[in-house]
Amino acid sequence: KSPVFGPQEVSSVEGNSVSIKCYYPPTSVNRHTRKYWCRKGASGRCITLVSSEGYVSSNYAGRANLTNFPENGTFVVNIAQLSRDDSGHYKCGLGINSRGLSFDVSLEVSQGPELPNGTEVYTVDVGRTVTIKCPFKTENAPKTKALYKKIGQTSVLVIDSRNYVNPNYKDRIRLRIPGTGQLIFTVVIDRLRLSDHGLYLCQAGDGSNRDEKNADLQVLEPEPELVYEDLRGSVTFHCALGLEVANVAKFLCRVNSRETCDVVINTLGKRDSAFEGRILLNPQDKDGSFSVVITGLRKEDEGRYLCGAHSDGQLQEGWPIQAWQLFVNEESTIPRSPTVVKGVAGGSVAVLCPYNPKESQSLKYWCLWEGAQNGRCPLLVESQGLVQEQYEGRLSLLQEPGNGTFTVILNQLTTQDAGFYWCLTNGDTRWRTTVEIKIIEGEPNLKVPGNVTAVLGETLNIPCHFPCKFSSYEKYWCKWSNTGCQTLPSQDEGPSEAFVNCDENSRLVSLTLNPVTRADEGWYWCGVKQGHFYGETAAVYVAVEEKKVAGSRYVSPAKADAAPDEKVLDSGVREIENKAIQDPRLFAEEKVVADTGDQAGGSRASVDSSSSEEQGGSSK
């Protein structure tokens, strides 16, 4: 017998949609092989209607799809706008139609329930609004108008023009009678509930001359949209609930095992701690639509999510909702990268950010997640070179190592730098990732002077001490600008007294500027790297002043000042309306930092460089 399994019988009604789930053993071969849905003909052949390779027959065009869920060993065939002609015998299967693994499914599409002649059908989602139109003749214009609900053989009054409202519809129904000449009255029902489903009767007047019109109200629960995202990646839920609730609090919640819905985030400031640092609720558009972005997806994020609107910021019956079923694929295309990076006060971190390698030309960004209200993520740096002012001299985004990874370096760390940061691009939004920076006890491994004042026209020598564990690493000096950090020639000067516990293996790499020019003013970084992978960095600011006395100026280790004043993120970064989907500048207005002049020329700047035999350790 075939190991493929599904529903043996599926029954539906005309106009409906069905979701047929077919299960298969999730072996590696099965997960990746072709999936199909075919119809058995009289000849015994099975004609493909839709397959996982993108084929859709003309009969199914625009109304069917097949989605594979390899993790669960499931594929789902969705078919919409069913007609009686769709009744028949089908197969869902793997491989080739004629000799694959398959399962027989019988689909029966029947006519909808018999409705009285002239019945108008209204199909509306739960929580939405319906307007029932009720025509009448001139002679019934002055008479009572009413709407009844048919329950079995009886009719229950719902609302009438004498101000009666059935308690079940209190505060969500109104009857509108137009001005003279218009022979139609309307009944508007807001915040539809599943219990509102049924047959209604409009009536104007009484006795044999009365006007009647039947209305069949079908209230539908939203079918969850299937969302399949990669582990460690990102998902965006777009929620459009309609203008009626544009000014009502919005929420995203997750259905739990008790079938209640736990708030994940809402516009009233509530947020589930499990999503700390990796969720944003993007500001609503004028039409009331909004979106929620969740990054750093975990297996436990799987489940059914609902977005909705209610003044309490949580799920309530009869308010509009949208639904998604989120699956998290463990066979992720998104590479593993550290979710926590640790650095010491005064030290640095180098964060590796993954991006879709097919989008090497995309713009890269790094932003700081802020949890206040709905969350926001002001951009700090981008690959085009814009850096927030308060990060000048201590933040850089590098395209290296490339091929799906870029690097962000942040130095001169303070405790205020602890927090969550997002890596993103203007391309594939599913590759947004989150990293947490933690500031731990310890000393920076690289030691540079705090403040340096150079004299115009003279020679400046800046030392950078590194411990023996970095001896096998490549050492470099670079001049920071808002477009990156331009590497300068540097010189390795051998043992140093800065690291007493590392005896003769301590090293010194120094930068020489000769002669000093006005253009040399600015931030310089000393750093270590292995190939295209960056390790620690240390920053020093060089100020340039007019010549006072003759002679060269050498900054010795003993004269190294304290680190430059810490630069704290300005809490007043202004927000702009988020366009997170089209534009990854998540709620940030970038302040352009003016380029700090020409890079120092290689002929004037030099650093002594010599190799060391000792193997270096990790830079983290």
Epitope: Q8, V10, N16, S17, Y23, N72, V76, E221, R304, A323
Partner: nanobody
Framework: EVQLVESGGGLVQAGGSLRLSCAAS????????MGWFRQAPGKEREFVAA??????????YYAESVKGRFAISRDNAKTTAYLQMGSLNPEDTALYYC????????????????????WGQGTLVTVSS
């Protein structure tokens, strides 16, 4: 909280038939799934049949061993599921459990117990030869 109560079990001769009922109380499901599992002495619990409903659609699932002999259905009040069992044989002897859940949109194989949140106490079916 939802309670499930099975009934209709008993002793029947091989070739005979029985109709099991599973009544749910506590709430009505506008969409959901109700299934039947069975457990013979010394054996693992196994899937028998399930019925899933959502938005006017009904999906019926059967284990290979009962296809063509058993039929699952439910009443329109959405509170009771039935298992009509025919051509019974001694291998069908077991304790039959009813299981239910409100969320048919979980894409977990519903032959496994995992998708079902609510369970009944079971009703015994004995088929004598």
């Amino acid at each position: 909280e939802v309670q499930l109560v099975e009934s209709g079990g008993g002793l029947v001769q091989a070739g005979g038939s029985l109709r099991l009922s599973c009544a749910a109380s506590g709430r009505t499901f506008s969409s959901g799934i109700m299934g039947w599992f069975r457990q013979a002495p010394g054996k693992e619990r196994e899937f028998v049949a399930a019925i899933e409903w959502s938005g006017g659609n009904t999906y019926k699932y059967y284990a290979e061993s009962v296809k063509g002999r058993f039929a699952i259905s439910r009443d329109n009040a959405k509170t009771t599921a039935y298992l009509q069992m025919g051509s019974l044989n001694p291998e069908d002897t077991a304790l039959y459990y009813c299981a239910a859940d409100e969320s048919p949109s979980r894409y977990i194989d519903l032959r496994r117990p995992a998708p079902y949140h609510y369970w009944g106490q079971g009703t015994l079916v004995t088929v004598s030869s």
